[in-house]
Amino acid sequence: QSSLTPLMVNGILGESVTLPLEFPAGEKVNFITWLFNETSLAFIVPHETKSPEIHVTNPKQGKRLNFTQSYSLQLSNLKMEDTGSYRAQISTKTSAKLSSYTLRILRQLRNIQVTNHSQLFQNMTCELHLTCSVEDADDNVSFRWEALGNTLSSQPNLTVSWDPRISSEQDYTCIAENAVSNLSFSVSAQKLCEDVKIQYTDTKM
């Protein structure tokens, strides 16, 4: 990737990622410098007859750093702080080639939950107020609520009325997704409204 247009690479929190490096064809490489956010990460001197000299210059990421045979950078056990700009400079006798990358760390979604604040009206209509959440949600998480294949809400919250006298059993499903994972959680309107009805009759007695 040229320095003008960094290659955007997705990594998953806790997993590994490779930043691919392409060599100039037919040229002898003198050394390769890898940088993270403009700070030196590693300095590599290739040798034709023996193993390359690899000098890791960033102790923070050092133990999680590895290099492939073609000197692509491999970073394991990814952390959120690995997010940022990476550059590789390949120096030959005649030129210096620069490759740029932007690493984005995404979380696998975990622990989807639905909270319910529902109420029963005098006419026995049940109004459901449902809120969906996942652990450590960020702006890259999309939420939606579906029932019978229709999207009823595009937000973590759903407000819907359910009348047991005219409605059949109905499940509402929250779907949370990001670029690397998705989770869903279904709730039964009938069950939620029965619970509200029990509370309603308990308080009346």
Partner: antibody, heavy 118, light 106 residues
Amino acid sequence: QVQLVQSGSELKKPGASVKVSCKASGYTFTNYGMNWVRQAPGQGLEWMGWINTYSGEPRYADDFKGRFVFSLDTSVSTAYLQISSLKAEDTAVYYCARDYGRWYFDVWGQGTTVTVSS
Amino acid sequence: QIVLSQSPATLSLSPGERATLSCRASSSVSHMHWYQQKPGQAPRPWIYATSNLASGIPARFSGSGSGTDYTLTISSLEPEDFAVYYCQQWSSTPRTFGGGTKVEIK
């Protein structure tokens, strides 16, 4: 039917403010996020950000942080976009668009042209 | 942010011809949405989640792709298909649109 109706065109002087409205009908307003999209003359579409119509919490794209404010009046199912300290480069058509999930904009307002000129 | 590059910028074709519109993302995305826009009009939803046609969209339109490469195909152009088409990604904030491909009559 589901529709979004926006307020009419505005001609403003640099430094002034403008408030664009987007009235929703035909669906439960608080169940779907509302997005704002800008289109400068002869240009493409730019996502400005969105507002959670249930909580009222806005989220702005980086280029639209500061002078741009999203707000709501849920009692009349209306979303608003306010732009302050107007500049000539704010001249554009501004669209509101409903998010049907996965940031797919299934219903769009007709657009409001804001012209900033001295 | 994820940059979407649409190509070609302009596609000059005759009615009845096949049109292939490309959208390339600077990073892998899960799905792509497409919109059609005609002069003086608001964009219209066209294809959602890569391959699903929006309500009322004729079957001559199709969408495909994965990762960084997505395509909108019109199997046989009708006069009403000449317009600008935009792709849009949802995987990462900010939600970004491509620069558009204008399909014009040759």
